[in-house]
Amino acid sequence: YDFTNCDFEKIKAAYLSTISKDLITYMSGTKSTEFNNTVSCSNRPHCLTEIQSLTFNPTAGCASLAKEMFAMKTKAALAIWCPGYSETQINATQAMKKRRKRKVTTNKCLEQVSQLQGLWRRFNRPLLKQQ
């Protein structure tokens, strides 16, 4: 999906209002310095591409993020403010359902959500030069 035509300001507002709080809740009890940010993004569409991938695509050691509260709200925000987004997700969700495992918060998941927090912070500061 090409995130170029999303309403970035509305997605940012939804993130600041509630999605960010849900990410913090998920990470509660974890030190903010515990994980290094290894995933980066260069502009808002790129950030949303990476956020979408880390949130909804199962990875080795962390198959369960798509059922978390922040993921549900992220899906809603992308569907509402990115034209045609929900139509592109049908095949991806069917494949994910087949692979879905029991919901467990692993250290790998915490690391992945830490990366997500970094991507969202970058999304909110699109004019900053890439480090």
Epitope: K10, A14, T18
Partner: antibody, heavy 122, light 108 residues
Framework: EVQLVQSGAEVKKPGESLKISCKSS????????INWVRQMPGKGLEWMGQ????????TYNGNFKGQVTISADKSISTAYLQWSSLKASDTAMYYC???????????????WGQGTTVTVSS | EIVMTQSPATLSVSPGERATLSCSVS???????LHWYQQKPGQSPRPWIF???NLASGIPARFSGSGSGTEFTLTISSLQSEDFAVYYC?????????FGGGTKVEIK
């Protein structure tokens, strides 16, 4: 204008099956989660589960998982709640509710259907 | 699961008086994830307050919400006849979504 219109009241016998509906209009149906909420006679509200019509993704309250099935048909902008074998304890009012970001970007159930009364009695 | 406890179950108030409704949450949640709904007999619930303190569209300013963490409050500064109803708090912090048992505001 956003509207959620639910199917009419139902009277059923224990063991029968049932599928009630919630037809949406006035917004992009595929892009918003639809929730189902139960209210037993004289009682409070209980969240049963939700569906994202865009891809059919569902989340259930564990208390209702296996008891009901939530589905949606995008082509007619309609969500469904169904039972394969009703019990007397399923007698209740059932509401569908859209969830979305309000003007302050808080996420909540912003529009509700009028409710469907289900009565299960022998 | 997060348990929402509302008190009192019934509040008897005279028109013009102040009403304070409480919602206690079993584990701390962000204020952005606490909402209030109003329900009148024979009607569907209506969104009333979003994110602890933000009035839904068309809700009169005599209503206000406050709180944080595990304790939240809905206040009606001067009750009008149309305010007599049941009010539910609800959390959107974790699954399953849960509602409080409701507070019925009735005429004294």
């Amino acid at each position: 204008e956003v509207q959620l219109v639910q199917s009419g009241a139902e009277v059923k016998k224990p063991g029968e099956s049932l599928k009630i509906s919630c037809k949406s209009s006035g917004y992009a149906f595929s892009s918003y989660w639809i929730n189902w909420v139960r209210q037993m006679p004289g009682k409070g509200l209980e969240w049963m589960g939700q569906i994202f019509p865009g891809d059919g993704d569902t989340t259930y309250n564990g208390n209702f998982k296996g008891q009901v099935t939530i589905s949606a048909d995008k082509s007619i902008s309609t969500a469904y709640l169904q039972w394969s074998s009703l019990k007397a304890s399923d007698t209740a009012m059932y509401y569908c509710a859209r969830s979305g970001f309000d003007y302050g970007y808080f996420y909540a159930m912003d529009y509700w259907g009028q409710g469907t009364t289900v009565t299960v009695s022998s | 699961e997060i348990v929402m406890t509302q008190s009192p179950a019934t509040l008897s108030v005279s028109p013009g008086e102040r009403a304070t409704l409480s919602c206690s949450v079993s584990s701390s949640i962000s204020s952005s994830n606490l909402h209030w709904y109003q329900q009148k007999p024979g009607q569907s619930p209506r969104p009333w307050i979003f994110g602890t303190s933000n009035l839904a569209s068309g809700i009169p300013a005599r209503f206000s919400g406050s709180g944080s963490g595990t304790e939240f409050t809905l206040t009606i500064s001067s009750l009008q006849s149309e305010d007599f109803a049941v009010y539910y708090c609800q959390q959107w912090s974790s699954y399953p979504l849960t509602f409080g048992g409701g507070t019925k505001v009735e005429i004294k």
